[in-house]
């Protein structure tokens, strides 16, 4: 009679994570008597996957009735496959004895596991940055297999080119991770902008996964300040306004100084929002000119989002008729305020 052969017809099998894998194995003879065992890997460190007669293998079931004496089909099904199950599986015939000895092994079936990448997580810089600055965004996705993967970056639908991507580990692994860093130049119009990381993988059937970051969490648009003197509101009274424009985020504190002395401090509350997502705010100061002998230097000082204060001044001529004058410095923060100075 011809010597027993162990036949594993499939050289490789690919299974999606969570599904069951069927590993086929048949023998050509009932002799010699002895059990079949399945192993993952070869050599002394091989892992026992299934033993016909003993051992606990809750995820493994035999495809046919392996207990029947005439059975020659020792195919198994492994349930709930994960990337950790990837490897080469060997169906091995043992000859019964004391102890049982390995008689013949099949050629092996390589099991590869297709595992979806996790949803990409995009994170931006820890601190806000101002327009014209370049900031870095990172995108991470984990747990996918096979290793081949495509990652793209977009800003408001426009593909970015300045990024660097790594897939780890470099060698063979049960699953892989991708890490990418993109550089984005901020503009004053970016409050409503989004940065998108898009990951495409064979397991996603052409429907890529996306992770997003809102630039509103990254950008700081400093305000522009303008101090103006309004026409006389009543005899000897002048209305001075400080217009705080195009700032983001809203967190802003404004202080009026009269000849360098603090006159009033307020926090921006009822702001108006511009189409680009930035804010405007205005603060008023009512000045009683008759209470002053000399010219008055009025300063609108703004602290925006915890940054160093910026200011703009206006010289109020007491001797002559009130006229609009101003001198620039810079600005940040918001509030609406009315104040009489006597």
């Amino acid at each position: 009679e011809e010597e027993l052969q162990v036949i594993q017809p499939d050289k490789s099998v690919s299974v999606a994570a969570g599904e069951s894998a069927i590993l086929h194995c048949t023998v050509t003879s009932l002799i010699p008597v002895g059990p079949i065992q399945w192993f993952r890997g070869a050599g002394p460190a091989r892992e026992l996957i299934y033993n016909q007669k003993e051992g606990h293998f809750p995820r493994v079931t035999t495809v046919s009735e392996s207990t029947k004496r005439e059975n020659m089909d020792f195919s198994i099904s492994i349930s709930n496959i994960t990337p950790a199950d990837a490897g080469t599986y060997y169906c091995v015939k043992f000859r019964k004895g004391s102890p049982d000895t390995e008689f013949k092994s099949g050629a092996g079936t390589e099991l590869s596991v297709r595992a979806k990448p996790s949803a990409p997580v995009v994170s931006g810089p820890a601190a806000r940055a101002t327009p014209q600055h370049t900031v870095s965004f990172t995108c991470e996705s984990h747990g996918f297999s096979p290793r081949d993967i495509t990652l793209k970056w977009f800003k408001n639908g426009n593909e970015l080119s300045d990024f660097q991507t790594n897939v780890d580990p470099v060698g063979e692994s049960v699953s892989y991770s991708i890490h990418s860093t993109a550089k984005v130049v901020l503009t004053r119009e970016d409050v409503h902008s989004q940065v998108i990381c898009e990951v495409a993988h064979v397991t996603l059937q052409g429907d890529p996964l996306r992770g997003t970051a809102n630039l509103s969490e990254t950008i700081r648009v400093p305000p522009t300040l303008e101090v103006t003197q309004q026409p006389v509101r009543a005899e000897n009274q002048v209305n001075v306004t400080c217009q705080v424009r195009k700032f983001y985020p809203q967190r802003l504190q404004l202080t009026w100084l009269e000849n360098g002395n603090v006159s009033r401090t307020e926090t921006a509350s009822t702001v108006t929002e511009n189409k680009d997502g930035t804010y405007n705010w205005m603060s008023w100061l009512l000045v009683n000119v008759s209470a002053h002998r000399d010219d008055v230097k009025l300063t609108c000082q703004v602290e925006h989002d915890g940054q160093p204060a910026v200011s703009k001044s206006h010289d109020l001529k007491v001797s002559a008729h009130p006229k609009e004058q101003g001198s620039n410095t810079a600005a940040e923060n918001t509030g609406s305020n009315e104040r009489n100075i006597y």
Epitope: L48, Q52, E54, G55, H56, T67
Partner: antibody, heavy 114, light 108 residues
Framework: EVQLQQSGVEVVQPGASVKLSCTAS????????MHWVKQRTEQGLEWIGR????????KYAPKFQGKATMTADTSSSTAYLQLSSLTSDDTAVYYC???????WGQGTTLTVSS | QIVLTQSPAIMSASPGEKVTLTCSAS???????LYWYQQKPGSSPKLWIY???NLASGVPPRFSGSGSGTSYSLTISSMQAEDAASYFC?????????FGGGTKLEIK
């Protein structure tokens, strides 16, 4: 439902023999080895041996060679453990265990006493 | 034969405490063939961990197993009152199969 039902309490005189039984239900007894384990009061577990009910082939721990004999009757789905030349050292609880190791009988208490 | 030595033989732990039981083999045991059982007084042993690190059905996730070669361990991340029991390691890597002497774990 898988069950291993063992015979009841045995009280036997020194020098005699006893045959303990373990009846399997819920599975084909030929599909698995059947193991026997000894546990003396408040002590550890000792592996006695295992039998392949399909062909009667068995393996014993050296300590139990000559003391224990395992047999199986596939028609009644029952495994047996015979213990001979009993002494007080054989007083213990004896468990049968299915080869997959998660199913144990409830144990048979054997007392050897004159 | 492979002798399995468990330590400590007896120990007590407070609720919430991390507990590690060890099982040392006199010669190498393949990790596929190293199992752990839990036994409470008056009951048959229950399969607790199989193939070194896999939890049997119904075993709480605070339990874990690890090891290779001649050194294996069972760890409870946070001891609970219901974990008080005896734990036995078991090898079926080579005949004769053997159990460790057991560790009796008590709750303080």
């Amino acid at each position: 439902e898988v069950q291993l039902q063992q015979s009841g309490v045995e009280v036997v005189q020194p020098g005699a023999s006893v045959k303990l039984s373990c009846t399997a239900s819920g599975f084909n007894i030929e599909a698995y080895y059947m193991h026997w384990v000894k546990q003396r009061t408040e002590q550890g577990l000792e592996w006695i041996g295992r039998i392949d009910p399909e062909d009667g082939e068995s393996k014993y721990a050296p300590k139990f060679q000559g003391k224990a004999t395992m047999t199986a009757d596939t028609s009644s789905s029952t495994a047996y453990l015979q213990l001979s030349s009993l002494t007080s050292d054989d007083t213990a609880v004896y468990y049968c265990v299915r080869g997959s190791y998660e199913y144990w009988g409830q144990g048979t208490t054997l007392t050897v006493s004159s | 034969q492979i002798v399995l030595t468990q330590s400590p033989a007896i120990m007590s732990a407070s609720p919430g405490e991390k507990v590690t039981l060890t099982c040392s083999a006199s010669s190498s045991v393949s990790s596929s063939y190293l199992y752990w059982y839990q036994q409470k007084p008056g009951s048959s042993p229950k399969l607790w961990i199989y193939s070194t690190s896999n939890l049997a059905s119904g075993v709480p996730p605070r339990f874990s197993g690890s090891g290779s070669g001649t050194s294996y361990s069972l760890t409870i991340s946070s001891m609970q009152a219901e974990d008080a029991a005896s734990y036995f390691c078991y090898q079926w890597s080579s005949y004769p199969y053997t159990f460790g002497g057991g560790t009796k774990l008590e709750i303080k």
